[in-house]
């Protein structure tokens, strides 16, 4: 997007003052994932808790079917953490036999679906090679940034492997957004 | 929390306009930790610098005795980074002898204490297995998200092992919150 | 900075209400880096895309020559992620011969330059040891926090080794700031 430059006086005409407490906001927390169909070349999307415990949606920011729904155009801060956990990765076993190998990896993507663009847009990606030797492993990937979003846009979190996501605690794996 | 749905007119009655510069905010930075007693089953809390260098508290957000004190109810963005550093973890030595083992780990928790609630609430957790072979290691864990907090709530940062926290630089280990 | 404590009435006199859409904001995304000279003891700075794709600058927040220029004084949330990628680090080869060694590392620093101050100020640092055995590796470092900045301040992102930065996708490596 081309950054728009407005003189303050121009901007203030079109951006009326508003109460901060009236802005769309959501913080979603992890739930146990049920296996779902997903396109072959697309990472599966996580679904979320939206009202129990620490989770909430407010001021027309709604959650439905894996998506956070953007209710008004503006600049949003969007964030997610996914904690992964797994057993010894295959690459380490191969390595022990002395053969270097493309490492296993874990990836989180925050994706935007917008009706004016035929492909989903990847807003944020965190990707990490995982080559642990001889044990269980666990680690988080955190992402957060600001984006200009349009009314009607849908946000989701995709991961490289749903079976590796730690769904045990609401503070370990989460997803949120708020209008600035 | 159940997501509250307000019509804009309803919301604006109860959320008067206010100057952004008047909102409670704090950024705290690491200091050398003094060993303190902590409950056996609870991670120890870090204490912080609140006014020197990059650190500040403003607009009734106060810091006292390891806690950030929330001066008014609302939605806050809360964040922390803790940089850990250590020597070779035990698990790697055991592993070298060919015995898989539960890995060592490092953990950061941002915790909320509410007077009216007996148990602290874990808002955010970052936890990572550490299995380094034959060397010193260092790495950060970053956390950040939005929460609905109440006046009087207290926030702290707990870590799995205070002796592993890098307290050498204010930009490596920090803790902050601001009202949205 | 010493945290300033204002009574609300005092604060509201000096902080007039303003439209949120009028605040300085920027999100910059990675581009291929051209090798440049940098001071021997200072990490090189990344340069950025500021208007194509997801990148934008608005409301007098400008980007020029590796720097984000702060157009007005206030509290800003500043963030960056840098994804690094590399081949087997040397330390692992040395290690395989049984000699512990200071690990290779990757570091990101968000730096503030103030004309009136001779030395740059490191606002945020993420630093991580990298000791991968026998493979390619990749991983992100994420940073974000709030700072009181002055009109005319300049922000940049420095990294320990530009050649390890993944510049292939705008969602992997980015830098942003917004006035709160």
């Amino acid at each position: 997007l081309k950054g728009q430059e407005f003189a303050p006086s121009h901007q203030q005409v079109y951006a009326p003052l508003r109460a901060d407490g009236d802005k769309p906001r959501a913080h979603l927390t992890v739930v146990r994932q049920t296996p779902t169909q997903h396109l072959k070349n697309q990472f599966p999307a996580l679904h979320w808790e939206h009202e129990l415990g620490l989770a909430f949606t407010k001021n027309r920011m709604n959650y439905t079917n894996k998506f956070l729904l953007i209710p008004e155009s503006g600049d949003y801060f969007v964030y997610s953490q996914v904690t992964f956990r797994g057993m010894t990765s295959e690459c380490s076993e191969i390595r022990q036999a002395g053969r270097p190998n493309k490492p296993d990896s874990i990836t989180v993507v925050i994706t935007k679906v917008t009706d004016s663009y035929p492909e989903p847009t990847q807003l944020l990606m965190g990707t990490k090679s995982v080559c642990e030797v001889g044990s269980n492993w666990f680690q988080p990937i955190y992402l957060g940034a600001m984006f200009s979003l349009q009314e009607g846009d849908k946000l989701m979190v995709n991961v490289s492997d749903i079976s590796l996501v730690d769904y045990t605690k609401e503070d370990k794996t989460f997803f949120g957004a708020f209008l600035l | 929390l159940k997501g509250q749905e307000f019509a804009p007119s309803h919301q604006q009655v109860y959320a008067p306009l206010r100057a952004d510069g008047d909102k409670p905010r704090a950024h705290l930075t690491v200091v050398r930790q003094t060993p303190t007693q902590h409950l056996k089953n609870q991670f120890p809390a870090l204490h912080w610098e609140h006014e020197l260098g990059l650190a500040f508290t403003k607009n009734r957000m106060n810091y006292t005795n390891k806690f950030l004190l929330i001066p008014e109810s609302g939605d806050y963005f809360v964040y922390s980074q803790v940089t850990f550093r250590g020597m070779t973890s035990e698990c790697s030595e055991i592993r070298q002898a060919g015995r898989p083992n539960k890995p060592d780990s490092i953990t950061v928790v941002i915790t909320k204490v509410t007077d009216s609630y007996p148990e602290p609430t874990q808002l955010l957790m970052g936890t990572k297995s550490v299995c380094e072979v034959g060397s010193n290691w260092f790495q950060p864990i970053y956390l950040g998200a939005m929460f609905s907090l109440q006046e009087g709530d207290k926030l702290m940062v707990n870590v799995s092992d205070i002796s592993l926290v890098d307290y050498t630089k204010e930009d490596k280990t920090f803790f902050g919150a601001f009202l949205l | 900075l010493k945290g300033q404590e204002f009574a609300p009435s005092h604060q509201q006199v000096y902080a007039p209400l303003r439209a949120d859409g009028d605040k300085p904001r920027a999100h910059l995304t990675v581009v291929r880096q051209t090798p440049t000279q940098h001071l021997k003891n200072q990490f090189p700075a990344l340069h950025w895309e500021h208007e194509l794709g997801l990148a934008f600058t608005k409301n007098r927040m400008n980007y020029t020559n590796k720097f984000l220029l702060i157009p007005e004084s206030g509290d800003y949330f500043v963030y960056s992620q840098v994804t690094f990628r590399g081949m087997t680090s040397e330390c692992s080869e040395i290690r395989q011969a049984g000699r512990p060694n200071k690990p290779d590392s990757i570091t990101v620093v968000i730096t503030k330059v103030t004309d009136s101050y001779p030395e740059p100020t490191q606002l945020l640092m993420g630093t991580k040891s990298v000791c991968e055995v026998g493979s390619n590796w990749f991983q992100p470092i994420y940073l974000g926090a709030m700072f009181s900045l002055q009109e005319g301040d300049k922000l940049m992102v420095n990294v320990s080794d530009i050649s390890l930065v993944d510049y292939t996708k705008e969602d992997k490596t980015f830098f942003g700031a917004f006035l709160l």
């Epitope: 169909q37 998506f67 679906v113 009706d115 004016s116 035929p118 989903p120 849908k154 | - | -």
Partner: antibody, heavy 116, light 106 residues
């Protein structure tokens, strides 16, 4: 593979309500947006509106807003179009189309004639 | 409404010719989309977000432009390219199409 199939009566009486259904297969349509576009004889394309099947949120062409309603039935993977108070000027080929979560795909179109 | 003015309304060219169609928006838009419609068929997306080739579309098709002026190009016209081509903007409500350009072979 991805398919969109429009269905409904080919003939509607003036002043009645035109009703069409679009059934989708081969993808999760809640990941996308569904549109209705029409093409009157010898004319160009006219966008009528769209629905987000995940939320049910709609957006309509203001020139048709008082007469058009788009709904979805997620249990049947269907999107429906209703256009009230039709006249001969509403005779057209009506297309449903998908956008957003995947490359654009259009149905083959359904010719609706408004005549007494 | 944002009006889309396409030109020419029709053109005739030889196989192998370079064909250019322009679309002018009545106010600035960020992106332009181009569709191909063959007789009796549904439209097919060729170019999205001004210059991106949709999946499976031959590389002889391209798009460019910004603001109010956008261009669609067929670098080497083929017999199977006989069709009507439409531009569309997605930003304003309603979404609006150009009136179409009919391309024929000489």
């Amino acid at each position: 593979q991805v398919q969109l199939q429009e269905s409904g009566p080919g003939l509607v009486r003036p002043s009645q309500t035109l009703s069409l259904t679009c059934t989708v297969s081969g993808f999760d349509y809640q990941d996308t947006y569904m549109h209705w576009v029409r093409q009157r004889p010898g004319r160009g394309l006219e966008w009528m509106g769209r629905i987000d099947p995940a939320s049910g949120h709609t957006k309509y062409n203001p020139s048709l807003k008082s007469r058009v309603t788009i709904t979805r039935d997620t249990s049947k993977n269907q999107v429906s179009l209703r256009l009230s108070s039709v006249t001969a000027a509403d005779t057209a080929v009506y297309y449903c189309a998908v956008s957003g979560g995947m490359p654009d795909v259009w149905g083959q179109g359904s010719l609706v004639t408004v005549s007494s | 409404d944002i009006q889309m003015t396409q030109s020419p309304s029709s053109l005739s060219a030889s196989v192998g010719d370079r064909v250019t169609i322009t679309c002018r928006a009545s106010q600035g838009v960020e992106y332009m989309y181009w569709y191909q419609q063959k007789p009796g068929k549904a439209p097919k997306l060729l170019i999205y977000a001004t210059s991106n080739l949709a999946s499976g579309v031959p590389s002889r098709f391209s798009g460019s432009g910004s603001g109010t002026d956008f261009t669609f190009t067929i670098s080497s016209l083929q017999p199977e390219d006989i069709a009507t081509y439409y531009c569309q903007q997605w930003e304003g409500n309603p979404r609006t199409f150009g009136q179409g350009t009919k391309v024929e072979i000489k």
